[in-house]
């Protein structure tokens, strides 16, 4: 007797006949930038404060007839999804609504900017607890809207936005494309991406995760006790705003980076049928459906990591792609991927006092992606150790020579156009887990980190015959920080991390034919933090 | 709303000396850029967000906005400052002809200018 969407986001330990997780986000204030709302609806009465902020364009069409219930429809439903008494996610959260969309659901970038500024000023005048801002709207890519979101996020506000309903790359829309914003796509009761008429949910690397967004029952502005089903990425974003409110209420000190990592960590993994997405977007789109954590506390001991894909480099010979971690995250490894297989590897380099992951395209290549592994590692001191191409036939090696530093990732970068085509494979010496080994004509980069209680180990999985994909996963309690392919396999397209699994992709063997160096080995570096685990136990 | 033409006349007089000199000229080598929505039907030409460089103070934002109005008035264009931003981004929202973009991009402190565009409920 509970709506499917609430059941879906509820971990099994809360699942009785009713959705009743502990606490309801009562320490958190959620700002909603949307249409006007029916604040006296039973679902939200007394829990939504309508601010006096209004910045909306005129409705289109001379014959447009303003009908209050229609004007309030979108905002009322979303307020209900976030905090509604009966069909809401965070039943204890208080909300404030700002009107930035008119009765036709249309607004402007400028109106939204002024709304975000209003929130910032309110926060400065009267600082409260954690703030979540829900932006259930989308427009074309906007540098200024993304910049405003970045500033607000850096002021400690959690922004959650709709990925967009255009069945398109979310990176082409704002605020969905803003890296600091938590961008949410929509799935249905079958965990399929939501189709909306001829369009549907947006996808791609700018989406952080998905959430229920089809046939979502919520407050209807038609009457004070009415309910209605609505669909869209706005509804999905409202679920995540509610989950964020619950998490922040349980742990008010969580930073945006910590919250995002937890949202990803507690999501249902690999349940979405990726065939719905365009082929070139499948690898970039996170296969994650949001869920509440199984308990409100006790996640702090975990080493959280996420994968961040860069934009595509473009096909020019010297093109590069850069993937960056959030300010509070550590870049623990860097890998690259090219659909054509023509790439010149990747390297970690300092940029503005922070490490970034840069991938290099090769001559004749269609372009590359850089893939950063971004982790939460308090008190970490990480550095990159580089070995230039070696003359010796045994290949290039580099290790973490500083006391107490452990290897978290390996990258390799080469100047020659087609490394490995005419070269015999390099054998990696066993029993040396703290070093990276690469082709003799490649420079090798080791990510070496020191952090209290950090320990890492290397795990490999090799397949002698050519395979399109080789994977190796870290076991329970360990987190994947590094993912790379052993050198010498020329047909490798690249390596990337999916959740806790390292994936090495090779060329379609059926088209390339079996090569002499057919073996593909995926190398995962798995880490854990004993310090975080101990700190967590002490707290409990 | 006050009589705008009266305001312009006053502003032109007030800013003539400042404008004719090189006070607050754009820093050498930095060029402000113009951005607009890639989706044509969503564009809202005639309204622009002028974003100023990060450390610009509110007083400088207001001065830059007034300067734009004065320079536009000298060229016979009517402009209207709809909002001055501060708190998140320094800058201002202006209603003006697209003909003035080149002029606006050369104003001191300007980082970039973005044409307003539509957003939609999702």
């Amino acid at each position: 007797s509970i709506p499917w969407n609430l059941e879906r986001i509820t971990p099994p330990r809360y699942r009785a006949d009713e959705y009743q997780p502990p606490d309801g986000g009562s320490l958190v204030e959620v700002y909603l930038l949307d249409t006007s709302i029916q604040s006296d609806h039973r679902e939200i009465e007394g829990r939504v404060m309508v601010t006096d902020f209004e910045n909306v364009p005129e409705e289109d069409g001379t014959r447009f007839h303003r009908q209050a219930s229609k004007c309030d429809s979108h905002g009322t439903h979303l307020a209900g999804v976030v905090s509604g008494r009966d069909a809401g996610v965070a039943k204890g959260a208080s909300m404030r609504s700002l009107r930035v969309l008119n009765c036709q659901g249309k607004g402007t970038v400028s109106g939204t900017l002024i709304g975000l500024e209003f929130i910032r000023k309110s926060q400065l005048v009267q600082p409260v607890g954690p703030l979540v801002v829900l932006l259930p709207l989308a427009g074309g890519y906007s540098r200024v809207l993304n910049a405003a979101c970045q500033r607000l996020a850096r002021a400690g506000v959690v922004l959650v936005t709709a990925a967009g309903n255009f069945r398109d790359d979310a990176c082409l829309y704002s605020p969905a494309s803003a890296p600091e914003v938590i961008t949410v796509g929509a799935t249905n009761a079958q965990d399929q991406p939501v189709t909306l008429g001829t369009l549907g949910t947006n996808f791609g690397r700018c989406v952080d995760l998905f959430a229920p967004g089809e046939d979502i029952i919520g407050a209807s502005s038609d009457c004070s006790t009415c309910f209605v089903s609505q669909s869209g990425t706005s509804q999905a974003a409202a679920h995540v705003a509610g989950i964020a409110a619950m998490m922040l209420s349980a742990e008010p000190e969580l930073t945006l980076a910590e919250l995002r990592q937890r949202l990803i960590h507690f999501s249902a993994k690999d349940v979405i049928n990726e065939a719905w997405f365009p082929e070139d977007q499948r690898v970039l789109t996170p296969n994650l459906v949001a869920a509440l954590p199984p308990s409100t506390h006790g996640a702090g001991w975990q080493l959280f990591c996420r994968t961040v894909w860069s934009a595509h480099s473009g096909p020019t010979r010297m093109a590069t792609a850069v993937a960056r971690c959030a300010p509070d995250e550590e870049l623990l490894s860097c890998s690259s991927f090219s659909r054509s297989g023509k790439r010149r590897g990747e390297r970690m380099e300092a940029q503005g006092g922070k490490l970034v992951c840069r991938a290099h395209n090769a001559f004749g290549g269609e372009g590359v992606y850089a893939i950063a592994r971004c982790c939460l590692l308090p008190q970490a001191n990480c550095s990159v150790h580089t070995a230039p191409p070696a003359e010796a036939s045994m290949g290039t090696r580099v290790h973490c020579h500083q006391q107490g530093h452990v290897l978290t990732g390996c990258s390799s970068h080469w100047e020659v156009e087609d490394l490995g085509t005419h070269k015999p494979p390099v054998l990696r010496p066993r029993g040396q887990p703290n070093q990276c080994v690469g082709h003799r004509e490649a420079s090798i980069h080791a990510s070496c980190c020191h952090a209290p209680g950090l320990e890492c180990k290397v795990k490999e999985h090799g397949i002698p015959a050519p395979q399109e994909q080789v994977t190796v996963a870290c076991e329970e309690g360990w987190t994947l920080t590094g993912c790379s392919a052993l050198p010498g396999t020329s047909h490798v397209l690249g390596a990337y991390a999916v959740d806790n699994t390292c994936v090495v992709r090779s060329r379609d063997v059926s088209t390339t034919g079996s090569t002499s160096e057919g073996a593909v080995t995926a190398v995962a570096i798995c880490c854990r933090s004993r310090h975080l685990a101990q700190a967590s136990q002490e707290l409990q | 709303q006050e009589d705008e033409d009266g305001d312009y006349e006053e502003l032109v007089l007030a800013l003539r000396s400042e404008e004719d000199g090189l006070a607050e000229a754009p820093e050498h080598g930095t060029t402000a850029t113009f951005h607009r929505c890639a989706k044509d039907p969503w564009r809202l030409p005639g309204t622009y967000v002028v974003v100023l460089k990060e450390e610009t103070h509110l007083s400088q934002s207001e001065r830059t906005a007034r300067r734009l109005q004065a320079q536009a008035a000298r060229r016979g264009y009517l402009t209207k400052i709809l909002h001055v931003f501060h708190g998140l981004l320094p800058g201002f929202l202006v209603k003006m002809s697209g003909d003035l973009l080149e002029l606006a991009l050369k104003l001191p402190h300007v980082d970039y200018i973005e044409e307003d565009s539509s957003v939609f409920a999702q």
Epitope: S1, D17, Q20, D40, S69, D86 | -
Partner: antibody, heavy 126, light 106 residues
Framework: QLQLQESGPGLVKPSETLSLTCTVS??????????WAWIRQPPGKGLEWIGS???????YYNPSLKSRVTISVDTSKNQFSLKLSSVTAADTAVYYC??????????????????WGQGTLVTVSS | EIVLTQSPATLSLSPGERATLSCRAS??????LAWYQQKPGQAPRLLIY???NRATGIPARFSGSGSGTDFTLTISSLEPEDFAVYYC????????FGGGTKVEIK
């Protein structure tokens, strides 16, 4: 079959607090599909909704009575209660309890009142 | 609040006749209107909900129509057990009831 039964004193003095309890049998009060309502009918007059509550204790009241009304729920006893403070002769009425479909679960039926209790007459008099 | 006005206050008819009861709202209630029947000493019983939908177990002789501000309950052919008081109720904005129409035997 779900049944509701009102109970409480039939006579209350002016300025005192009227207290009634509704006991639900034949079904559980614990369900997000329903709210539980109090409605009254002064002798020879029409019906007036007083307020409603769900099993989690979430209430909403008639704005005209809000300052005097408290509705509470006791899921362990499958009961919900009404308290109306500072009563006057104008509060003399037959008080009904009723189930109200919340509308959250469409399969539970339309968002209206039913079934109802038989009603209990409360007279306010000194 | 939304005020519902029922007319007539009393309707005197014979069994077999057609009864037409009216309910007018002070502002639009869309189709969020219900009709209840109440017999002496009994609790009200839901007949029609959302203006025109018959509740479970209600005979086909009862029908509802209207939307916005004007609504009608029609009993196509009165049966002896239909003589009672009928109330309309809206839920567009919280809950209010009409003053009732008494259908009595002529």
């Amino acid at each position: 079959q779900l049944q509701l039964q009102e109970s409480g004193p039939g006579l209350v003095k002016p300025s005192e607090t009227l207290s009634l309890t509704c006991t639900v049998s034949g079904g559980s009060i614990v369900s997000s599909s329903y709210y539980w309502a109090w409605i009254r009918q002064p002798p020879g007059k029409g019906l007036e909704w007083i307020g409603s509550i769900n099993y989690k204790g979430s209430t909403y009241y008639n704005p005209s009575l809000k300052s005097r009304v408290t509705i509470s729920v006791d899921t362990s006893k499958n009961q919900f209660s009404l308290k109306l403070s500072s009563v006057t002769a104008a509060d003399t009425a037959v008080y009904y309890c009723a189930r109200e479909n919340s509308g959250v679960v469409p399969a539970a039926g339309p968002n209206w009142f039913g079934p109802w209790g038989q009603g209990t007459l409360v007279t306010v008099s000194s | 609040e939304i005020v519902l006005t029922q007319s007539p206050a009393t309707l005197s008819l014979s069994p077999g006749e057609r009864a037409t009861l009216s309910c007018r709202a002070s502002q639009s209630v869309s189709s969020y209107l219900a009709w209840y029947q109440q017999k002496p000493g009994q609790a009200p019983r839901l007949l029609i909900y959302d203006a025109s939908n018959r509740a479970t177990g209600i005979p086909a002789r009862f029908s509802g129509s209207g939307s916005g501000t004007d609504f009608t309950l029609t009993i196509s052919s009165l049966e002896p057990e239909d003589f009672a008081v009928y109330y309309c109720q809206q839920r567009r904005n919280w809950f209010t009831f009409g003053g009732g129409t008494k259908v009595e035997i002529k």
